[in-house]
């Protein structure tokens, strides 16, 4: 994922719960991570910007059978407010950048983590 | 290995302003949050408030609230608390602690703690 | 503000001893809780976070369980070391709030 930086409202901004239920869900699959995640699949890099929400959704709703991440594809679905379904692309997604499922997770959580903690200290 | 250093013991007279500053090493220090602590004489612990140091937004205990004022500083990785008023009820241990709110908690690392006098 | 009520105050325990120590939130944390051990002249140490999940080095004698408002903290078989005070912590919501301490002292 890039742009990590330069804090743009990643729209709709989930309530402070639901965003640290997610970032929970994101910590237990990279820390039970035993095989690779998703027998090493991999997804569109996203930009961690307005609407990264229906991005990274977009991205990983192309994974199937993996059910170590079905769980957060349901959460990103709550946080999207439109209909995502596979094959489907916003301009969000980095088209030439295709990074491992387990490092698309790391990447997204590390972005959450910083957006937490900044509706936490606003 | 994640280490806050605090700065050294102070005496203090009553009105006076204190600055304490907490030095953090073996981790970035934008990663996590920074908290502060006060402990009196033989009492129990007491949260102050905290800053976000990649964006300097704060939060606090609203006891405390025109007392402490919280402040980090990313290009020496050193977070500070300035204590203003001073008043012989401020003599007490304090600590700065820090963590990952969701790997260890908000204060899974701590410093070694800043003991303030306040005596006229 | 949530009131966290930590109890008891202080017990005196035996080396071998089962210690069980409680926690109870004015409201539902959530399981966002710590449990911390303080020794006299130094700082706290973190020994669970997540109200049951225990930090890298600690002793596996300590444990934390509970959920919604009422936690524990439990030392399985109290060692010569692990005489010292002990605090919760809620990191549910602003403002973070401690338990008033459990001082566990040698019987």
């Known amino acids: 994922l890039t742009c990590l930086g330069g804090f743009a409202s990643p729209g709709p901004v989930p309530p402070s719960t639901a965003l640290r239920e997610l970032i929970e869900e994101l910590v237990n699959i990279t820390q039970n991570q035993k095989a690779p995640l998703c027998n090493g699949s991999m997804v569109w890099s996203i930009n961690l910007t307005a609407g990264m929400y229906c991005a990274a959704l977009e991205s990983l709703i192309n994974v199937s059978g993996c059910s170590a991440i079905e769980k957060t594809q349901r959460m990103l679905s709550g946080f999207c407010p439109h209909k995502v379904s596979a094959g489907q692309f916003s301009s969000l997604h980095v088209r030439d950048t295709k990074i491992e499922v387990a490092q698309f997770v790391k990447d997204l959580l590390l972005h959450l983590k910083k957006l937490f903690r900044e509706g936490q200290f606003n | 290995e994640v280490q806050l250093v605090q700065s050294g013991a102070e005496v203090k007279k009553p009105g006076a302003t204190v600055k304490i500053s907490c030095k953090v090493s073996?981790?970035?220090?934008?990663?996590?949050?920074m908290h502060w602590v006060q402990q009196a004489p033989g009492k129990g612990l007491e949260w102050i408030g905290g800053?976000?140091?990649?964006?300097?937004?704060?939060a606090s205990n609203q006891k405390f609230k025109g007392k402490a004022t919280l402040t980090a500083d990313k290009s020496t990785d050193t977070a500070y608390m300035e204590l203003s008023s001073l008043r012989s009820e401020d003599t007490a241990v304090y600590y700065c602690?820090?963590?990952?709110?969701f790997g260890g908690g908000p204060f899974a690392y701590w410093g070694q703690g800043t003991l303030v006098t306040v005596s006229s | 503000d949530i009131k966290m009520t930590q109890s008891p105050s202080s017990l005196s325990a035996s080396v071998g001893d089962r210690v069980t120590i409680t926690c109870k939130a004015s409201?539902?944390?959530?399981?966002?809780l710590s449990w911390f051990q303080q020794k006299p002249g130094k700082a706290p140490k973190t020994l669970i976070y997540?109200?049951?999940r225990l930090v890298d080095g600690v002793p596996s004698r300590f444990s934390g369980s509970g959920s919604g408002q009422d936690y524990t903290l439990t030392i399985s078989s109290l060692d010569p070391e692990d005489f010292a005070t002990y605090y919760c912590?809620?990191?549910?919501?602003?403002?973070?709030?401690f338990g008033g301490g459990t001082k566990v002292e040698i019987k």
């Open positions: 602690t820090s963590g990952d709110y």
């Open positions: 073996g981790y970035t220090f934008t990663d996590y949050e």
């Open positions: 800053i976000d140091p990649e964006t300097g937004g704060t």
């Open positions: 409201q539902d944390i959530n399981s966002y």
């Open positions: 997540r109200a049951n």
């Open positions: 912590l809620q990191y549910d919501e602003f403002p973070y709030t």
